[in-house]
């Protein structure tokens, strides 16, 4: 047990801890406790191992909790005695009743208990708390009074806390042994004397606060602890608290007040006052700040401080700005020469400071005016602006210029200079409200900014835009398209020079709009064709001119395609266009589909007038037989060399139709061999045979090819053997196999095919195609139709 | 519920600069002071020092006064440890601890931030 | 500064045993200690303050008793999540201190 008295006042719990060592025993250990009042023998009290080991007297006690055992620890245990009382002074013997087997050391030991009355006394004890309410800044004190009867030889310790809603902070404590304390947070303002403890008298105790801050606020409360030295060891004996003042800090009234709002003529001076208002007559110093704003809001990141006066009475500013004061309530910003960039909202701010232990300072209060709203009136420049078109577009295509002149009744006036901005408005087809497009903007170093309508433009320099004369700005399009078509009107705005040589906008300008527009009427574009000489027959030369007119179309040139509509002898079938020749806008002729090789030069299309084109085929056949149109397209002029498709028309169509009672044509094939072995010589004739007029055989020719389907191959189309023309020149095809073939006629009529060491791949089925050719009165051979 | 949330593990050289984050919530953030703890590894609790968050004021141990310094973001709630001209003896874990309503005692505290000083 | 001496640096224990870890200070420190547990990896988690003053749920096996400069943390029925390092700290005089910490191992 402890080795030292232990002193405890009445009211207060005593503990008294007893603990066991180096034992054999088992781990844990049971204790016995026993009291004797002073000479007395001892009287058991309480014990961890017998329910029954306690005096009556002491069972009551422990029933009701005032006394109990609580075990720390295997080999500890605490006696606890509740609401110590005189009759509790004496000795307490803590022994172990079954440490060890064999006896060796002490198996007990003892502790003396002093109790004192309670000779302690602590105030005030005003209740509730008073309430002091002070200012930031200000100084307030506390006293507790706190004293000791006790006949030992007592310290008295002493701390002061301060409690703020939940929270308990120590201020600053005096220690038992005469120690200063401060709390955390107080270390500063205690070593500069802002905080200190002090004694006034032998019982009071003052806490000193020479300069409060908003965080002083709370309920103070004084704690008073009482101590003994028992053989060099300091004990807390008792403790009491009392409750002395709750402070309150009032937050310190502050206002600053500017004029509404003032009108100042350009070039003058802007005066301005910032009357301050407060409750603060101490020790504060003022801090004021003026600054500016373009919107009426000073926390906007735009504001800009003009002036400062600090603290210490130091004035910082811009340059022609200055900031003084009348007396320690009125200050004034003066703003020298204002011009338009000084019209905006002025805003006073003010700071009161108090000093702060170390020569520090801290603010107390902090005020923002309202806003001086801050006009600049000037002498604006005095002009109109008038926008014509020099050049209007008939068509697409065509160039647009607009001039936008200024009038200005003092144009002469160095420190005034012009811009100009082009915008472009379509035209209203509803009651939609039409936004107007940026097309180009001057700033007032004369640099042109395109809008995104325009850039591409405006770098392909298809737009144009110029400052021709001094008082005339131009924009020309270059090549108007039908989505330039719209109202143009520009905006010449006045730039005014500031005092640092920079421009500020003064005033704009609108210009009435102009109209581009031009009839988007269709393009038309109408062909006739017509045939000079309407009668003649093969072999003569066919003409046919075709006369091109048009309208809505800008500087046309016409492109020519001839072509033929022929009929094909099935009639279910669509009929044939056949493309011959063409002339394209720049008069280039090209064949088309021509395949003609022995009339290479039997077709020719020519460009009599820009606006007439003639056609001519000579020697026609029979074969030539159809419906003949020209095709025109016209072309309209781009960007130089470019032509851009404006319409495209058919003629009417010319016939060319042979009405001929000429012979009728049949051919027809024969075998005297149609089954034949490997080896064996095949032989096939085909037979014309002609019906109606009687025609010399002078007259005719034939031109002949055979076809085979093989058997090899019955799903194939036929393969060309050999071909005779009407020249009598053989033509055979390449094959793969030995077999020969020769083809001959034989008579007028007659063709011969042979197959010589006929093969298995010679044997399927055979044709003949036959194109008869007849002279014609005039001597020129007339291709017919092709017969099978 | 009270809770600091510190920023991530940082790697750095001998010489640079680091800060340290803390974020707090679930209490008035100006109502508590906000302590830093360091714990080298394998090491103990070694307390850097405090800052009021009504005034801003800061105080340092003796063993971190000059490349310590403590900071505030009280709109955004967040606390800041920055250490200057790291060394080799910085590596350790950071904590950011509030003080409690009772003489500021460390309640509640952050999960910690991991500086690695290497080069 | 004030010194804080945990004079066990580590304990091996059973489960269900009494522990008490004590700690003590170079001078008075007015009952402004506080009891710290530390598992691997985790940030301290306050048990105790104001020497005897037990947190809002911490398990009532833990007290805290002591005054002037000795202290101690018992723990009744030690549990296996019990097993971690225990620092106590005086919070009444700057700077702030530790004790060098007990680590608690099962035996």
């Known amino acids: 047990v402890p080795t030292a008295t232990l002193v405890r006042v009445v009211g207060t719990e005593l503990v008294i801890p007893c603990n066991v060592s180096d034992y054999d025993g088992p781990s844990e250990q049971n204790f016995d406790w026993s009291f004797s009042s002073l000479g007395s023998s001892f009287v058991e009290l309480a014990s961890t191992w017998e329910v029954g080991f306690p005096a009556q007297l002491y069972q009551e006690r422990l029933q009701r909790g005032e006394i109990l055992l609580r075990r720390t620890a295997n080999d500890a245990v605490e006696l606890h005695i509740k609401n110590v009382q005189p009759s509790d002074q004496g000795h307490y013997k803590c022994s172990t009743p079954s440490t060890d087997a064999t006896v060796q050391g002490n198996y007990e030991d003892t502790v003396q208990v002093k109790v004192l009355a309670d000779s302690l006394h602590v105030g005030p004890s005003a209740r509730p708390p008073p309430s002091l309410s002070l200012r930031e800044g200000e100084p307030f004190e506390l006293r507790c009074t706190a004293a000791s009867a006790s006949p030992l030889h007592t310290h008295l310790a002493l701390l002061w806390e301060v409690h703020r809603g939940p929270a308990r902070r120590s201020v600053l404590a005096l220690t038992h042994e005469g120690r200063f304390h401060p709390g955390l947070g107080y270390e500063q303002r205690y070593h500069s004397g802002d905080v200190r403890l002090d004694t006034v008298g032998s019982d009071a105790y003052r806490l000193s606060v020479s300069r409060a801050l908003s965080a002083d606020q709370g309920s103070y409360r004084c704690i008073v602890s009482e101590w003994i030295a028992e053989q060099g060891n300091w004990q807390e004996i008792q403790e009491k608290a009392v409750e002395v003042a709750t402070v309150v800090i009032q937050p310190s009234v502050l206002r600053a007040a500017v004029p509404k709002n003032v009108s100042v003529a350009e070039g003058k001076e802007l005066d301005l006052t910032c009357n301050i208002t407060t409750d603060r007559a101490d020790d504060v110093r003022p801090e004021v700040t003026w600054s500016f704003s373009r919107m009426p809001d000073s926390t906007l990141p735009g504001s800009r401080v003009l002036a400062r006066l600090d603290r210490d009475s130091l004035v910082h500013s811009s340059p022609h700005v200055a900031l003084s004061h009348v007396d320690a309530r009125s200050y004034h910003l003066l703003v020298r020469d204002v011009s338009k960039e000084n019209s905006g909202y002025y805003y006073c701010h003010v700071s009161l400071w108090a000093p702060g232990h170390n020569r520090s300072w801290h603010k107390v209060a902090e005020a923002v005016s309202s806003p001086a709203g801050v006009g600049v009136t000037w002498l604006e420049p005095d002009y109109q602006v008038y926008l014509n078109a020099s050049k209007v577009p008939g068509f697409a295509d065509d160039p647009t210029e607009l001039a936008c002149r200024v009038v200005d009744t003092k144009s002469g006036e160095a420190n005034v200079r012009f811009t100009v901005s082009w915008y472009y408005r379509m035209n209203r087809r509803s009651d939609n409200v039409v936004t107007s497009e940026l097309l180009a903007v001057m700033d007032g170093d004369w640099t042109l900014k395109y809008g995104e309508r325009s850039k591409q433009r405006a770098q392909d320099g298809d737009f144009i835009f110029s400052k021709e004369h001094t008082d005339t700005f131009n924009f020309r399009i270059q090549r108007t398209t039908e989505e330039d078509r719209g109202n143009y009107y520009c905006v010449v705005s006045a730039w005014t020079k500031q005092r640092n040589n920079s421009w500020v906008k003064s005033k704009d300008v609108f210009s009435k709009p102009v109209n581009i527009f031009w009839a988007l009427e269709d393009s038309v574009l109408v062909v006739k064709a017509r045939q000079p000489k309407p009668f003649f027959a093969a072999g003569n030369t066919f003409e046919m001119t075709c006369k091109v007119s048009s309208k809505n179309i800008k500087s046309p040139r016409y492109s020519v395609l001839i072509m033929a509509e022929k009929p094909v002898g099935d009639l279910s079938s669509p009929n044939e266009t056949k493309y011959i020749i063409s002339l394209d806008q720049d008069s280039v002729v090209k064949l088309e589909n021509w395949t003609d090789a022995s009339r290479v030069d039997g077709v020719v299309l020519e460009k009599v007038q820009e606006d007439e084109f003639r056609y001519r085929m000579y020697q026609t056949q029979v074969s030539d037989a159809g419906l003949y149109r020209c095709m025109v397209t016209a072309w309209s002029p781009v960007r130089g060399s470019l032509w851009r498709e404006a319409a495209t028309s058919l003629s009417n169509p010319i016939e060319i139709d042979f009405q001929t009672s000429g012979p009728i044509f049949n051919a027809s094939v024969h075998s005297d061999t149609p089954s034949v072995i490997r080896g064996d010589l095949i032989k096939l004739f085909c037979i014309i045979t002609v019906e109606g007029a009687a025609l010399d055989p002078d007259d005719m020719a034939f031109d002949v090819s055979w076809f085979a389907v093989h058997s090899f191959g019955l799903d194939k189309a036929p393969v060309l053997l050999s071909s005779l023309d009407r020249k009598g020149i053989v033509t055979t095809s390449r094959r793969d196999w030995k077999s020969d073939l020769s083809l001959e006629r034989v008579s007028v009529l007659e063709f011969l095919l042979q197959v010589h060491g006929s093969e298995d791949q010679d044997f399927g089925n055979y044709y003949c195609s036959v194109t008869p050719w007849v002279k014609s009165p005039t001597g020129s051979w007339q291709k017919e139709a092709e017969i099978h | 519920e009270v809770q600091l949330e510190e920023s991530g593990p940082e790697l750095k050289k001998p010489g640079e600069t680091v800060k340290i984050s803390c974020k707090a919530s679930g209490y008035t953030f100006t109502d508590s002071s906000m302590h830093w703890v360091k714990q080298a590894p394998g090491k103990g609790l070694k307390w850097m020092g405090w800052?009021?968050?009504?005034?801003?004021?800061?105080t340092y141990a003796d063993d971190f006064k000059g490349r310590f310094a403590v900071s505030l973001e009280t709109s955004a709630s967040t606390a800041y440890l920055q250490i200057n001209n790291l060394k080799n003896e910085d590596t350790a874990t950071y904590f950011c601890?509030?003080?409690?309503?009772?003489?500021?005692?460390?309640?509640?505290w952050g999960q910690g931030t991991s500086v690695t000083v290497s080069s | 500064d004030i010194v804080i001496t945990q004079s066990t640096p580590s304990f091996s224990v059973s489960p269900g045993d009494r522990v008490t870890i004590i700690c003590k200070a170079s001078?008075?420190?007015?009952?402004?200690l506080a009891w710290y547990q530390q598992k691997p990896g985790n940030a301290p988690r306050l048990l105790i303050s104001?020497?005897?003053s037990l947190e809002t749920g911490v398990p009532s096996r833990f007290s805290g008793s002591g005054s002037g400069k000795d202290y101690a943390l018992s723990i009744t029925s030690l549990q296996t999540e019990d097993v971690a390092t225990y620092y106590c700290h005086q919070y009444w005089s700057t700077p702030w201190t530790f004790g060098g910490g007990t680590k608690l191992e099962i035996k």
């Open positions: 601890a509030r003080g409690g309503p009772n003489y500021y005692v460390m309640d509640y």
């Open positions: 800052i009021n968050t009504e005034t801003g004021e800061s």
């Open positions: 001078e008075d420190i007015y009952n402004r």
């Open positions: 104001g020497a005897t």
